[in-house]
């Protein structure tokens, strides 16, 4: 529940990219279970793919959506499926790959004066006077109007890391997701555990920057498993 999420102090893991090494800057922060973007972390490689169970689209990666693997299949068993490319059939925006949205049951390009909820700086900066646009950001719906090209700066609301400027990733912060700085060498990071609990996550750190990976700090090897400190270190 939201209550347990927001009362948790847990800082859990961030996923490595598809088929990549943990900490590669190309990876995005996955949504975590909880208030607005429920979900968990996942790890998958091309040669050892394991379907990731999900309940909502936000639990899946940027190029995936959550659905039953078979038409008319058990609604209780849903996994992350590869997004639908342009001109493929769809039922909702999340089914279409980034840069596209679902229109009349077909994935079409977002560059036709539409925007698939990939919030960018111009929108967060167009909050509007005195409640005119709330936070200038629609969480689940398509944003229609003109196209926006400026990437989100640190602190901007986002949906995914591609919404953020270089050196930033999209990470959870309480009831929202905002652009946060990618971690530098020596900064504390959160080590992803491939198996086990997809614990609650209300405050996410970004992944480690290029050339860095999240590893246990050498002088903490003797520490108990639960208190091991991980930092971004050179490969």
């Amino acid at each position: 529940t939201l209550n347990s999420v927001l009362n948790s102090n847990a800082i859990k893991n961030l996923p490595p990219p598809l088929g990549g090494a943990a900490g590669h800057p190309g990876s995005a922060v996955s949504a975590a279970p909880g208030i607005l973007y429920p979900g968990g972390n996942k790890y998958q490689t091309i040669d050892n793919y394991q379907p990731y169970p999900c309940a909502e689209d936000e639990e899946c990666g940027t190029d995936e959506y959550c659905a039953s693997p078979t038409r008319g299949g058990d609604a209780g068993v849903q996994i992350c499926l590869a997004c639908r490319k342009r001109r493929k059939r769809c039922m909702r925006h999340a089914m279409c790959c980034p840069g596209n949205y679902c229109k009349n049951g077909i994935c079409v390009s977002s560059d036709q004066n539409h925007f698939r909820g990939e919030i960018e700086e111009t929108i967060t900066e167009s909050f509007g006077n005195d409640h005119s646009t709330l936070d200038g950001y629609s969480r689940r719906t398509t944003l229609s109007s003109k196209m926006y090209h400026t990437k989100g700066q640190e602190g901007s609301v986002c949906l995914r890391s591609s919404d953020c400027a270089s050196g930033l990733c999209c990470a959870r912060h309480f009831w929202s997701k905002i652009c946060k700085p990618v971690l530098k060498e020596g900064q504390v990071c959160t080590k992803h555990r491939r198996k086990g609990s997809h614990g609650l996550e209300i405050f996410q750190r970004c992944y480690c920057g290029e050339g860095l990976s999240c590893r246990i700090q050498k002088d903490h090897h003797q520490a108990s498993n639960s208190s091991r400190l991980h930092t971004c270190q050179r490969h």
């Epitope: 208030i35 709330l134 929202s176």
Partner: antibody
Framework: QVQLVQSGAEVKKPGASVKVSCKAS????????MHWVRQAPGQRLEWMGV????????SYNQKFKGRVTITVDKSSSTAYMELSSLRSEDTAVYYC??????????WGQGTLVTVSS | DIQMTQSPSSLSASVGDRVTITCRAS??????LNWYQQKPGKAPKLLIY???RLHSGVPSRFSGSGSGTDFTFTISSLQPEDIATYYC?????????FGQGTKLEIK
């Protein structure tokens, strides 16, 4: 244009409960979290709790745990905050605030709740 | 809970003056600091979020700076309509907490 309109002032006796409403318009109600913040006379603002209208999930400030209940009625785009076991120190202006980011951008006009015997 | 302490509690300044309010957090809150303006009988209004980002429609004479535990809110040239109480708010750790406020008056 986003608008949050709250119910009118209330006068309550100690031990009673109060339920304040906040009707939202100008946006899709289920797409933003609704927070409740109170301000006692001459005091600082105090966050009470939050609800996600899309699924009813809530979180409360531990200070009010057990006394505050936040609910929503999606059909009328209205959020409610109920505070029970009222005491004199609960006399305050209660605000609803709708937001997506970790800040409060949109506020209701406030509802004064007076607790007096 | 994280305690937020503002100083001064009140201040008097003349139109055109540069006004500075400080906010200190009881622990490191990184950049997770917002500033609000509240006029008597009105709801607070968001001015600055994430330490220094100006909310839309807010005049550029308002600015924010700082990091960690010490933050500063500045009005570069005080205007008559700026008379209000200003609050800082941390959103680093739940529950979000506010400073006690700084009441700004015109000399």
């Amino acid at each position: 244009q986003v608008q949050l309109v709250q119910s009118g002032a209330e006068v309550k006796k100690p031990g009673a409960s109060v339920k304040v409403s906040c009707k939202a318009s100008g946006y899709t109600f289920t797409e933003y979290t609704m927070h409740w913040v109170r301000q006692a006379p001459g005091q600082r603002l105090e966050w009470m709790g939050v609800i996600d209208p899309s699924n009813g999930d809530t979180s409360y400030n531990q200070k009010f745990k057990g006394r505050v209940t936040i609910t929503v009625d999606k059909s009328s785009s209205t959020a409610y905050m109920e505070l029970s076991s009222l005491r004199s120190e609960d006399t305050a202006v209660y605000y609803c605030s709708s937001t997506t980011g970790p800040w409060f951008a949109s506020w209701g006009q406030g509802t004064l709740v007076t607790v007096s015997s | 809970d994280i305690q937020m302490t503002q100083s001064p509690s009140s201040l008097s300044a003349s139109v055109g003056d540069r006004v500075t309010i400080t906010c200190r957090a009881s622990q490191d809150i990184s950049n997770y600091l917002n500033w609000y303006q509240q006029k008597p009988g009105k709801a607070p209004k968001l001015l600055i979020y994430y330490k220094s980002r100006l909310h839309s429609g807010v005049p550029s004479r308002f600015s924010g700076s700082g990091s960690g535990t010490d933050f500063t809110f500045t009005i570069s040239s005080l205007q008559p309509e700026d008379i209000a109480t200003y609050y800082c708010q941390q959103v680093h750790t739940l529950p979000p907490t506010f400073g006690q406020g700084t009441k700004l008056e015109i000399k």
